[in-house]
Interface confidence: low
């Protein structure tokens, strides 16, 4: 009970108490990508590893088709972990040529439905250019914040690129949330 | 309780409720390394002040010997960030020589050791190549998750060269973890 | 209870527990910066958006004039993202022309101010040295951990250079902190 | 290119551990996930387990679980499978599968066969 | 556990027919995945992530359903098609496989 054990003596209104133990909780690990179809101008969603390894959902926590379906209303720390690996970006090259000199980019993005609104809420965005003079390049994007959800949104992280998408290791590539 | 103030009349089993300030939580901020020997392939673990300054160990959560030692199963927020400074990498003149042009790199692994287990397990790994056309360069590397731990596990943060890591204030690199 | 449901017959005493949903927290999300004023050698603090859209503070935790106020003293953990953005650094040039070769770079710092104390805290940082060999750049800095903080703190978040902060959306650039 | 190949006894006593090396090139074996499965005689296939040899981390088919052991050697590019207090029951064709998030690639199988 | 159950057991097609084998799981998986079994051999990937060609798999094979439902089809039988097919869930614990069709030619 707030701030005391037991429930003074004049009548008050407390809100509920739970055991941590059982709040909505999900660490799901990366797994190798599939080309998938997607709309124009619209990232693709990764899909994930739900029990294997490190991975896990409990509490009513679900995972399904790329998403993690909220059970209860409440505020969750949600984040992810993108590690990104591919060739040299030619942006040098573009730059020298002449051509137009928007740098290569690698984005995450975890994204929000709700069935009733028409329209996906982009929680939390970390996006990079990529204009490496090296060979191969390899960076992760890191995201992490506190949001107020509702019972039966869904959660999504999606990718402007799956193909440069690190999927070797469950270390590298995560996504997470739990109710606070 | 779960969901309600008192207990139902009805018999029911909750799980057990607990005080958040009795929760096992540390964080460690980053002391001056001395170098050590590490068996090759391994990366070297960091050591960490956890009692000076913004550091602080509590509630049986206990640092010692470059491990924070975890002293009740649960599921653990676990934390790190390590800001890496260095000179310039040569990875631009190694490419124009025509070596081999694999980047410099730098890494970031939170290990979790489990004297039951022979093999310590990779919870987290933050990776970026370094290929710097400047000449000192600095960055972080963030990483942050929530894992299901047991009573005994030890957690430790490893690098890929313990020489890069800047150690010189400890808002800039640190360690941290706390039961949900 | 810790432990279990009721109390034991035996007196014991027991931090008091507390329903997690009245827990002070806060998301703020960024708004676009007026340039302001500030000391030699000190960042420049962000302001905030606290209500609109992605953002909120509730349970008493307030914001007003850059800073949250720390309702409650206990463990928070707290967080931010700030996305820059920005010309080509011309750290290349400056090298081969043979001026000093330290590099241009970007920070982010997390502070606490506490009345009682004559300086502010800083709790978190996140730097790093800006190098690009294309033109327009672009990248997050996040940062993220836990500390003990007294009621009536007061927490901002500063940045090396105001004018790189990118403001178009409340997912790019956002600060929070929650009680644990 | 990729290869798998599995190698051991082929034949084992009832009650005796079965034990079984899987070797690999062609490949980063840290780069995948290394699964074990088998095939009894004229029967389907049964997935036992697999292992991320980057980590270590393991996940066992319950219904074998209290019985097998999947370990690496990264140094070797190998990975073994125990399986211990064997029966006629166990008696199979053993295949290791290389897969990076789905199976991909397998060895060409090593008879084993459980008899006294 | 997830339960594969694939259907028919057995099926014997004429060389140019369109063959068609489907695997129902016991609870809703994201994607499923085939192989190919020649008599004494390995298994082969055939189809990933429901409707993908593996590598160097001819267009003849494909893959598709959703849910619990998933469908393998052969467009046109030929002789050197004559195998067990078998699909695999991977997302549940254990990876369980479907029993296998055998197909023959008639």
């Known amino acids: 009970l707030k701030g005391q054990e037991f429930a003074p003596s004049h009548q008050q209104v407390y809100a509920p108490l739970r055991a941590d133990g059982d709040k909505p909780r999900a660490h799901l690990t990366v797994v190798r990508q599939t080309p998938t179809q997607h709309f124009k101008n619209q990232f693709p969603a990764l899909h994930w590893e739900h029990e294997l390894g490190l991975a896990f959902t409990k509490n009513r926590m679900n995972y399904t088709n790329k998403f993690l379906l909220i059970p209860e209303s409440g505020d969750y720390f949600i984040y992810s972990q993108v590690t990104f690996r591919g060739m040299t970006s030619e942006c040098s090259e573009i730059r020298q040529a002449g051509r137009p000199n928007k740098p290569d980019s690698i984005t995450v993005v975890i994204t929000k439905v709700t069935d009733s609104y028409p329209e996906p809420t982009q929680l939390l965005m970390g996006t990079k250019s990529v204009c490496e003079v090296g060979s191969n390049w390899f960076q992760p994007i890191y995201l992490g914040a506190m949001f107020s959800l509702q019972e039966g949104d869904k959660l999504m992280v999606n990718v402007s690129d799956i193909s440069l998408v690190d999927y070797t290791k469950e270390d590298k590539t995560f996504f997470g949330a739990f109710l606070l | 309780l779960k969901g309600q103030e008192f207990a139902p009349s009805h018999q029911q089993v909750y799980a057990p409720l607990r005080a958040d300030g009795d929760k096992p939580r540390a964080h460690l901020t980053v002391v001056r390394q001395t170098p050590t020997q590490h068996f090759k392939n391994q990366f070297p673990a960091l050591h960490w002040e956890h009692e000076l300054g913004l550091a602080f160990t509590k509630n049986r959560m206990n640092y010692t010997n470059k491990f924070l030692l975890i002293p009740e199963s649960g599921d653990y927020f676990i934390y790190s960030q390590v800001t890496f400074r260095g000179m310039t990498s040569e990875c631009s003149e190694i490419r124009q020589a025509g070596r081999p042009n694999k980047p410099d790199s730098i890494t970031v692994v939170i290990t979790k050791v489990t004297d039951s287990y022979p093999e310590p397990t990779q919870l987290l790994m933050g990776t970026k190549s370094v290929c710097e056309v400047g000449s000192n360069w600095f960055q972080p590397i963030y990483l942050g998750a929530m894992f299901s731990l047991q009573e005994g596990d030890k957690l430790m943060v490893n690098v890929s060269d313990i020489s890069l890591v800047d150690y010189t204030k400890e808002d800039k690199t640190f360690f941290g973890a706390f039961l949900l | 209870l810790k432990g279990q449901e009721f109390a034991p017959s035996h007196q014991q005493v027991y931090a008091p527990l507390r329903a997690d949903g009245d827990k002070p927290r806060a998301h703020l999300t960024v708004v676009r910066q007026t340039p302001t004023q500030h000391f030699k050698n000190q960042f420049p603090a962000l302001h905030w958006e606290h209500e609109l859209g992605l953002a909120f503070t509730k349970n008493r935790m307030n914001y007003t004039n850059k800073f949250l106020l720390i309702p409650e003293s206990g463990d928070y953990f707290i967080y931010s993202q700030v996305t820059f953005r920005g010309m080509t650094s011309e750290c290349s040039e400056i090298r081969q022309a043979g001026r000093p070769n330290k590099p241009d770079s970007i920070t982010v710092v997390i502070t606490k101010v506490t009345d009682s104390y004559p300086e502010p805290t800083q709790l978190l940082m996140g730097t790093k040295s800006v190098c690009e060999v294309g033109s327009n750049w672009f990248q997050p800095i996040y940062l993220g951990a836990m500390f003990s903080l007294q009621e009536g703190d007061k927490l901002m978040v500063n940045v090396s250079d105001i004018s790189l902060v990118d403001y178009t959306k409340e997912d790019k650039t956002f600060f929070g902190a929650f009680l644990l | 290119q990729v290869q798998l190949q599995e190698s051991g006894p082929g034949l084992v006593r009832p009650s005796q551990t079965l034990s079984l090396t899987c070797t690999v090139s062609g490949f980063d074996l840290q780069d995948t996930y290394i699964h074990w499965v088998r095939q009894r005689p004229g029967r389907g296939l049964e997935w036992m387990g697999r292992i991320d040899p980057a980590s270590g981390h393991l996940k066992y088919n319950p219904s074998l679980k209290s019985r097998v052991t999947i370990t690496r050697d990264t140094s070797k590019n190998q990975v073994s499978l125990r399986l211990s207090s064997v029966t006629a029951a166990d008696t199979a064709v053993y295949y290791c599968?290389?897969?990076?998030?789905?199976?991909?690639?397998w060895g060409q199988g090593s008879l084993v066969t459980v008899s006294s | 556990d997830i339960q594969m159950t694939q259907s028919p057991s057995s099926l014997s097609a004429s060389v140019g027919d369109r063959v068609t084998i489907t695997c129902r799981a016991s609870f809703s998986v994201d994607y499923m995945y085939w192989y190919q079994q020649k008599p004494g051999k390995a298994p082969k990937d055939l189809i990933y992530?429901?409707?993908n060609l593996a590598s160097g798999v001819p267009s003849r094979f494909s893959g598709s359903g959703s849910g619990t439902d998933f469908t393998f089809t052969i467009s046109s039988l030929q002789p050197e098609d004559i195998a067990t097919y078998y699909c695999q869930q991977w997302e549940g614990n254990p990876r369980s496989f479907g029993q296998g069709t055998k197909v023959e030619i008639k």
């Open positions: 992530a429901t409707s």
């Open positions: 599968a290389r897969s990076g998030g789905m199976t991909d690639y």
